[in-house]
């Protein structure tokens, strides 16, 4: 006699929404073997029994989780094989916050994995990566687990959030960090990853109270094409509303883009300039609040923007667009920025 189960594993992980067939068969020298599945929930799959075999079909619903047993008998001899079925949900639905990181700020980054099952800290792990390595010096805050709002009745899915406090990202800052979420199941390891871009700046604010010998200062060979004259600001070639950085967009290759800097002759005036050849024009397309409340002067390849009435520059995103081509440069001005005094 031979008793076979296919697939032969004693534990099987099934993705939610996918089906799986487990075939149990037995050959019998004297007559036909009797094979059947038992220990089945009424909801756990459907069984098709044939002479000498029985096929269990699992529909990939969360309620299909269980441990059915296949029993085969031939004459006075019987065999059995249990299969632990785990239905899991791990879609690529990672959400990170904030959408970008600002070097030089003490900040918390969060990473949420949505529509997860099982919601077990032992099977789901989070990591904050710099390149392929865990980010040294990050501090993991307490994880959170919440039930997702379900459109239909059934076993609930969960969202799990991990937060970290970030160490100083060093100078120059790395182009991006990554949140990596790993689900470890029997004989199966699944991983999703989401980028958290880091704004590049020529002059990152200094962390408070640092000493020269502090550990965990990260360095990166990536550099940004950024102009920051007099203002403690960050410019970034990218598309609105929030930049998605990659090592390539941080290099000086690629399309010719406008540059933003402070017009030193004009105190709080920002100047957007294009130097990509004749026929290029630039204009301001985004500013904190209402763009109409700013004073704008546009003259071909140059465009100026200033606050009305004259005062400190507002904190937030500024954007300048170049035509033809539509390339944009985004600029983030942090709050309480002190301009260079002009003589």
């Amino acid at each position: 006699q031979s008793f076979q189960v296919n697939p032969p594993e004693s534990e099987v992980a099934v993705a939610m929404g996918t089906s799986l067939q487990i075939t149990c068969s037995m050959s019998c020298d004297e007559g036909v073997a009797r094979v059947h599945w038992r220990g089945l929930d009424t909801s756990l799959g459907s069984v098709q029994t044939l002479p000498g075999s029985s096929i269990l079909s699992v529909r990939g619903m969360l309620s299909d989780t269980g441990t059915p047993v296949c029993v085969g008998s031939c004459g006075s001899r019987s065999f059995q094989h249990s299969v632990k079925i785990l239905v899991y949900a791990f879609p690529d639905q990672l959400v990170v916050s904030p959408e970008f990181l600002v070097p030089g700020q003490d900040q918390v980054v969060s990473c949420t994995a949505h529509n997860i099952w099982p919601a077990d800290p032992n099977s789901l792990s989070f990591a904050l990566l710099l390149g392929e390595q865990r980010l040294e010096g990050a501090q993991a805050l307490e994880p959170e687990q919440e039930e997702e709002i379900q459109e239909a009745e059934g076993t609930p899915l969960f969202r799990m959030t991990q937060r970290w406090r970030l160490p100083s990202l060093g100078t120059p800052a790395p182009p991006a960090l990554h949140c990596q979420v790993t689900m470890q199941l029997p004989k199966l390891v699944l991983t999703h990853r989401k980028e958290i871009p880091v704004l590049q700046s020529q002059t990152s604010p200094k962390p408070p109270n640092t000493t020269s010998a502090e550990p965990y200062i990260l360095t990166s060979s990536s550099t940004a094409e950024a102009v920051s004259t007099g203002l403690n600001i960050t410019t970034l070639p990218s598309a609105p509303p929030y930049p998605k950085l990659s090592p390539r967009t941080l290099s000086s290759e690629g399309p010719c883009r406008p540059k933003i800097h402070q017009d030193l002759e004009a105190g709080w005036e920002l100047l957007c300039e294009a130097s990509c050849g004749p026929g290029v024009t630039v204009r301001w397309t985004l500013a904190p609040g209402d763009l109409a409340t700013y004073h704008k002067r546009e003259a071909g390849a140059q465009a100026w923007l200033s606050v009305l009435p004259p005062g400190p520059m507002v904190e937030g995103w500024f954007q300048c667009r170049q035509d033809p081509g539509g390339e944009v440069t985004n600029l983030y001005v942090p709050g309480q920025v002190t301009p260079n005094s002009s003589s």
């Epitope: 918390v108 805050l141 307490e142 109270n209 502090e214 965990y216």
Partner: antibody, heavy 119, light 107 residues
Framework: EVQLLESGGGLVQPGGSLRLSCAAS????????MHWVRQAPGKGLEWISY????????NYADSVKGRFTISRDNSKNTLYLQMNSLRAEDTAVYYC????????????WGKGTTVTVSS | DIQMTQSPSSLSASVGDRVTITCRAS??????LAWYQQKPGKAPKLLIY???SLQSGVPSRFSGSGSGTDFTLTISSLQPEDFATYYC?????????FGQGTKVEIK
Amino acid sequence: EVQLLESGGGLVQPGGSLRLSCAASGFTFSDYWMHWVRQAPGKGLEWISYISGDSGYTNYADSVKGRFTISRDNSKNTLYLQMNSLRAEDTAVYYCARDRPYYYYMDVWGKGTTVTVSS
Amino acid sequence: DIQMTQSPSSLSASVGDRVTITCRASQSVSRSLAWYQQKPGKAPKLLIYAASSLQSGVPSRFSGSGSGTDFTLTISSLQPEDFATYYCQQYKSYPVTFGQGTKVEIK
């Protein structure tokens, strides 16, 4: 000079409430996450709660969750711990401690205030 | 939660002795480990952070080493003012946890 000074401790009956304060001076209080750590008589140190500089993040040890509330008033440079439903096992010296930005160890501690829960 | 285990729980030593205290974490804490000194009736005082960095103002006879799960605090030449209880603390993840303490007594 950087200083933390706790107050508000005392004797309280089981089930009672107490509010501890921690007055900070010598540094920009709002830039720092702050902690409460306690030490029962003859025992080791137990972290019980933290609060971020802008009060946006708080967390508690399981032993006090649902009973204690941490808060801060940055305009007064003061950290608070509201303790409700006190139990005998909450008897301890309570310390406030400052958390070092970017590195996260507790670099400055107060002298402590004693809380005794007894009938 | 990450458990921190110190050894020994107490030790007797003489002035001038070299003293070593170990701390073991139940899982890796990288280098996110601090050592504190506490004298009776006083608040803890930070000695070492990031496993081996000496806090400003702390005498150089104190040193820390280790990473991952195994850490050591060494006092190269014990002084009279060093008799106290020493705690390790991991701050890699919450809840932050302390070792149970090592009491250094006069022999």
